[in-house]
Amino acid sequence: IYGGQKAKPGDFPWQVLILGGTTAAGALLYDNWVLTAAHAVYEQKHDASALDIRMGTLKRLSPHYTQAWSEAVFIHEGYTHDAGFDNDIALIKLNNKVVINSNITPICLPRKEAESFMRTDDIGTASGWGLTQRGFLARNLMYVDIPIVDHQKCTAAYEKPPYPRGSVTANMLCAGLESGGKDSCRGDSGGALVFLDSETERWFVGGIVSWGSMNCGEAGQYGVYTKVINYIPWIENIISDFGGGGSGGGGSAKFVAAWTLKAAAHHHHHH
Amino acid sequence: MASMTGWKIHYTSTAHACPYPMAPPNGHVSPVQAKYILKDSFSIFCETGYELLQGHLPLKSFTAVCQKDGSWDRPMPACSIVDCGPPDDLPSGRVEYITGPGVTTYKAVIQYSCEETFYTMKVNDGKYVCEADGFWTSSKGEKSLPVCEPVCGLSARTTGGR
């Protein structure tokens, strides 16, 4: 996180640390699912059990955390690795339910009305243990408040080289300051960009840290996030088809609107 | 001169009547007859909220047949009050006995609730009654447990710490 500050206990109780290859993040859904970026869990997809999933901690290196393990990984079928970041979304099913408390709480999925809290200039919050402006992974969970950027403005920012035309799709949203300095970065990948629903007083996930400019926090460039509201049917289908309850049991996965990968991941951390 | 026609013997037989079936408490015998002889049968029906049991084992129906030796082919069952048994534990929740401590028999009421703050009840209001079929049943007719679903989106940033 560039230009951020240290999170305090209970600020981001949905924050999940994903280790396996390198560092990435995710957000807890319900009590046995993790929402993350497809690119963050793609390369080690042939061994789900290799994913080391930690939650309930602020400190990246702390021995005090709640351990969770993956039962299955579901990568969106529209995601093509190393060919842009469209459909950069994945779900991890945990093999057991986690106990919810003030330090471990799921994030809400956006309601239909959520777009009214995600208009241009509305503030979202990104959090993670990724690179800071000092050039190192953060030891303490960091967060930054950043405004949503007009979609056309973001598309234009990424139409000049070295970015290929069409990098920013309708399945993405952008956030950051035109002047730069506040952004998510490598190692934050898969984490949630959250917004406050002022009607329910609950936080929901609007974006997933996906990609951005080569230099995090660069002026005139923005962090790009998977637009979660476009994937609500996909998320709900997988969760209903593959069961809310973590059984610890496994069983052969079936193919629903996703590649079903009993998989763990190597993380690119383009962000 | 008398004609020789031989002996005539007339046989009559009376079937052994079986003992009169006394209905178990909270049950009744059908059909009611003055007596029950060979191949006659009776069934036992229990009042609502009571079930046929042979010892610990449940029966859906009971019919006994009178045998030629004057005994019934099956012993009389009992009509025992339906017992739904201890309710299942609710993950991330608890159960309270409303009717009385540990009361799990017909028409007993229990109330499920979820752990405060972090879980909320889905499916129904958590009130279950022991019905005549032996299942704990919600007011909506569900026999499955309610669900304690985690409350999402809570943060110390909005609640000022919890």
Partner: antibody, heavy 114, light 107 residues
């Protein structure tokens, strides 16, 4: 003629779940009675595991209750046993039986071993 | 749990002998007791239910009696095919329990 037939793996690894199915022919399991699982360790006596009744209610031996699930598939006229976290002490011949034992399956030996 | 104590645990007898096996329940079980015969490698075969009711097809030499806590299985004239192990079973009270068995061997 009422017949019961047990089926399932004969070898289960320790800590895993033992799963057996009893297929009933000649009588519907929803018509009446309790449908039991009973086991017999080699050279030992009989132990009642539990039953599922005609209505779908279950009753389990308290010594095994935390590990046992008995369920049924009425469309196939089958009832099943699942016993979790098995150890060598769960090695036995497993029988399914109707009511108080008027009809029995032939039994299936399940060995718990790594 | 109700203990069903069978005695003797084994006995030797000759063809034609009258054999009596007893089963004592640790609590009153009414007449809800069954008796089974089991041969090596085979499933138990039902003989008696409700303490004294013989299953159809079971020879009349087998009879059962008793109620409450004391139960008896009698074989009036032992036949060669009767050499086996016999179990009593109470189904009156949860959990259902079995006796330890009586092995009837050839003298």
């Amino acid at each position: 003629q009422v017949q019961l037939q047990e089926s399932g793996p004969g070898l289960v690894k320790p800590s895993q779940t033992l799963s057996l199915t009893c297929t009933v022919s000649g009588y519907s399991i929803t018509s009446d009675y309790a449908w039991n699982w009973i086991r017999q360790p080699p050279g030992k006596g009989l132990e009642w595991i539990g039953y599922i009744s005609y209505s779908g209610r279950t009753s389990y031996n308290p010594s095994l209750k935390s590990r046992v699930t008995i369920s049924r598939d009425t469309s196939k006229n089958q009832f099943s046993l699942k016993l979790s976290s098995v150890t060598a002490a769960d090695t036995a011949v497993y029988y399914c039986a109707r009511y108080w034992g008027d009809y029995w399956g032939q039994g299936t030996l399940v060995t718990v071993s790594s | 749990d109700i203990q069903m104590t069978q005695s003797p645990s084994s006995l030797s007898a000759s063809v034609g002998d009258r054999v009596t096996i007893t089963c004592k329940a640790s609590q009153n079980v009414g007449s809800n007791v069954a008796w089974f015969q089991q041969k090596p490698g085979k499933a138990p075969k039902p003989l008696i239910y409700s303490a004294s009711y013989r299953y159809s097809g079971v020879p009349s030499r087998f009879s059962g009696s008793g109620s409450g806590t004391d139960f008896t299985l009698t074989i009036s004239s032992l036949q060669p095919e009767d050499f086996a192990t016999y179990f009593c079973h109470q189904y009156n009270t949860y959990p259902l329990t079995f006796g330890g068995g009586t092995k009837v061997e050839i003298k």
